[in-house]
């Protein structure tokens, strides 16, 4: 499967949509900045094999999809952009799932990177907790939007892994 190119293109489209989704000036939200601790150190220090990279990226996109599929998210963003963004993420998930089947076979699932998947889940838990604490305020969503954009562009090592042959 030609994942690197497809994923890169969809990722860029998703990031463009995410960038367009902003409703208020970020300049007014500086005091709401928060340390979510994206697990970049763990990712940077690891050479991902293709199946590993696929499953960790899948988890990141799945968690992002879940985050932006909530009722609170629907109230925060312009509906048509949110729908386009969610569709783009959904397509990415389908691409990754198709690739997993092709790479490791339908029965096999890569278990060696449970730690990475757990780190991603904890990261998104911190984001969800922050939104709850901030009562899903417009600035809180703006901070989360900036953080998601940053984490998407951070996952360079994962994307390198997509180009590897297992």
């Amino acid at each position: 499967c030609d994942l690197p190119q497809t994923h890169s293109l969809r990722n860029r489209r998703a990031l463009i949509l995410l960038a367009q989704m902003g409703r208020i000036s970020p300049f007014s939200c500086l005091k709401d900045r928060h340390e979510f601790r994206f697990p970049e150190e763990e990712f940077d220090g690891h050479q991902f094999q293709k199946t590993q990279a696929i499953s960790v990226l899948h988890e990141m996109i799945q968690q992002t999809f879940n985050l932006f599929s909530t009722e609170d998210s629907s109230a925060a963003w312009e509906q048509s952009l949110l729908e386009k963004f969610s569709t783009e993420l959904y397509q990415q998930l389908n691409d990754l799932e198709a690739c997993v089947i092709q790479e490791v076979g339908v029965e096999e699932t890569p278990l060696m990177n449970e730690d990475f998947i757990l780190a991603v889940r904890k990261y998104f838990q911190r984001i969800t907790l922050y939104l709850m604490e901030k009562k899903y305020s417009p600035c809180a969503w703006e901070v989360v939007r900036a953080e998601i954009m940053r984490s998407f562009s951070f996952s360079t090592n994962l994307k390198k892994g997509l180009r590897r042959k297992d």
């Epitope: 902003g22 970020p26 709401d32 900045r33 900036a146």
Partner: antibody, heavy 121, light 107 residues
Amino acid sequence: EVQLVQSGAEVKKPGESLKISCKGSGYSFTSYWIGWVRQMPGKGLEWMGIIDPSDSDTRYSPSFQGQVTISADKSISTAYLQWSSLKASDTAMYYCARHPGLAWAPDFDYWGQGTLVTVSS
Amino acid sequence: DIQMTQSPSSLSASVGDRVTITCRASQSISKFLNWYQQKPGKAPKLLIYFASSLQSGVPSRFSGSGSGTDFTLTISSLQPEDFATYYCQQSNTLPFTFGQGTKVEIK
């Protein structure tokens, strides 16, 4: 390698206009804001204003509002600082620096080398 | 605007000395406080961000502390290359503002 490269030194007369530039490279230009800082001879740092190159949203310090214009051209990864009518008191070193916006990352971690503007009759 | 007041304005110290510079904000800025070092003819260099995070590549003898309105930059053992001017800057709200600077000179 992240770099902010500023345009060269300028010598101008009072009343003249001027536009200095700051070109970013080695990073996604639209993912960071660009701030401008003034330093008059022998004095401290003064924050002038900031721009989000992704949509050109701009904010100024009250001291500089109406005195200068900050702009950006994301297609060439360049931010600008301009004056329509220079005064002798605009003589200073001007620095640009990048800011990570709302991301939890170092503020103003990379700076341009500075552009010296001299206004004298 | 938030006013930032640094003290002292200048100080004389010897190599090996422990140096402390303080910065006070006119209102609470949480931990949104940065410290910069500037040498003559050079652009400022970020040392500490978010009050206590050491910028990559900055020696560990530099440390920052504080939150709210009172902040401190400490150089645990002054080195010859540390003689410079130090500035604090708040990034809690726009407009960002700098302290007036502290010049660290050789005794």
